[in-house]
């Protein structure tokens, strides 16, 4: 069964900067990745970025840079322009559309006890959907 993992990491040097890492574990080719916050895409979440494996990226504030890390994983750098970051208690979700598996989505957030520079473990939280 395919799985999606999500890591949320606070940057040690910049407390208002976060990076979301997402990956797809499974066979098949990825056709699109959607990253949202505040909930799953299309279920109350706000879209932050869309990444296509051939055609590039579209991203929305506060996303700073979305990019492919490997053929099956992406990263999204986020930056809060305000003094205090709204990201600490926020849920980030990544949806991978793949062929022939369909769409798989998982969500994660920064662990409450995280020190800057530490990240959430790369395990999917219970919100895992196959469309």
């Amino acid at each position: 069964t395919p799985e999606v993992w999500v890591q949320v990491q606070m940057e040690a040097t910049e407390l208002s900067s976060f990076t979301v890492h997402c990956g797809f574990l499974g066979p098949g080719s990825i056709s699109l990745v959607t990253v949202s916050w505040g909930g799953p895409d299309g279920a109350g979440g706000t879209k932050l970025a869309v990444l296509h494996p051939e055609l590039g990226t579209r991203q929305w504030a506060p996303a700073r840079q979305a990019r492919w890390e490997t053929q099956s994983s992406i990263s999204l750098a986020l930056e809060d322009s305000g003094a205090s970051s709204p990201f600490a208690n926020t849920t980030f979700c990544c949806k991978f559309a793949s062929f022939p598996e369909g769409s798989w989505e998982s969500c994660g957030s920064l662990p409450p006890s995280s020190d800057p520079g530490l990240s959430a473990p790369p395990t999917p939280v219970p919100i895992l959907r196959a469309d």
């Epitope: 706000t46 051939e54 055609l55 590039g56 579209r58 991203q59 929305w60 990019r67």
Partner: antibody
Framework: EVQLQQSGPELVKPGSSVKISCEAS????????VDWVKQSHGKSLEWIGA????????SYNQKFEGKATLTVDKSSTTVYMELRSLTSEDSAVYYC????????????WGTGTTVTVSS | DIVMTQSQKFMSTSVGDRVSITCKAS??????VDWYQQKPGQSPKTLIH???SRHTGVPDRFTGSGSGTDFTLTISNIQSEDLADYFC?????????FGGGTKLEVK
């Protein structure tokens, strides 16, 4: 026919602000993002940023953050770009362009707005 | 930022000829490249998207090719109305960046 009609030329003083518009017609406004591009005289093109008409979500080239602000008025199917603290470097033609979300490219360009900054 | 280099600033050609305009990306951008034509005093017009897909209504004299870092716009059977500037654009990473442009002169 899909059209992006931009506002007319602007002659503005250094240090001031200007707000230019891009009125969309001939398609479902909410279905396409609108991006803005700068063309300085005799030079190439620079991508400024984009706006999603659905929720007003924006994305900017870091070079233009603090310089350009994009807004949308869904009732008039118009996107606006405000440029502030103008200098001679901001003198250029500014274009809006429609982004096709499913195909990932600009398919229609606006008529262009010339902004001249001069005292 | 990704730099898109159009090394030929000017190209001169004759009606009926074939010309290739090149664009080189400073890093792999897969197929996330488009080509735009801008005639004097006009707004840009879309020719090619996704490196090789012709935009609706564009004559088949215009062909796009390439992937990764090297891209080419080929115009065959050049017509006088092809006098224009041609720009490439990458949308692989933010910020999107354009090439410096190639001005095509038709003799």
């Amino acid at each position: 026919e899909v059209q992006l009609q931009q506002s007319g030329p602007e002659l503005v003083k250094p240090g001031s602000s200007v707000k230019i518009s891009c009125e969309a017609s001939g398609y479902t406004f909410a279905d396409y993002n609108v991006d803005w591009v700068k063309q300085s005289h005799g030079k190439s093109l620079e991508w400024i940023g984009a706006i999603n008409p659905n929720d007003g979500g924006t994305s900017y080239n870091q070079k233009f953050e603090g310089k350009a602000t994009l807004t949308v008025d869904k009732s008039s199917t118009t996107v606006y770009m405000e440029l502030r603290s103008l200098t001679s470097e901001d003198s250029a033609v500014y274009y809006c362009a429609r982004w096709v979300n499913n195909d990932w490219y600009f398919d229609v360009w606006g008529t262009g707005t010339t902004v001249t900054v001069s005292s | 930022d990704i730099v898109m280099t159009q090394s030929q600033k000017f190209m001169s050609t004759s009606v009926g000829d074939r010309v290739s305009i090149t664009c080189k990306a400073s890093q792999n951008v897969r197929s996330a490249v488009d080509w735009y034509q801008q005639k004097p005093g006009q707004s840009p017009k879309t020719l090619i998207h996704s490196a090789s897909s012709r935009h609706t209504g564009v004559p088949d004299r215009f062909t796009g090719s390439g992937s990764g870092t090297d891209f080419t716009l080929t115009i065959s059977n050049i017509q006088s109305e092809d006098l224009a500037d041609y720009f490439c654009l990458q949308h692989w990473n933010y910020p999107y960046t354009f090439g410096g442009g190639t001005k095509l002169e038709v003799k």
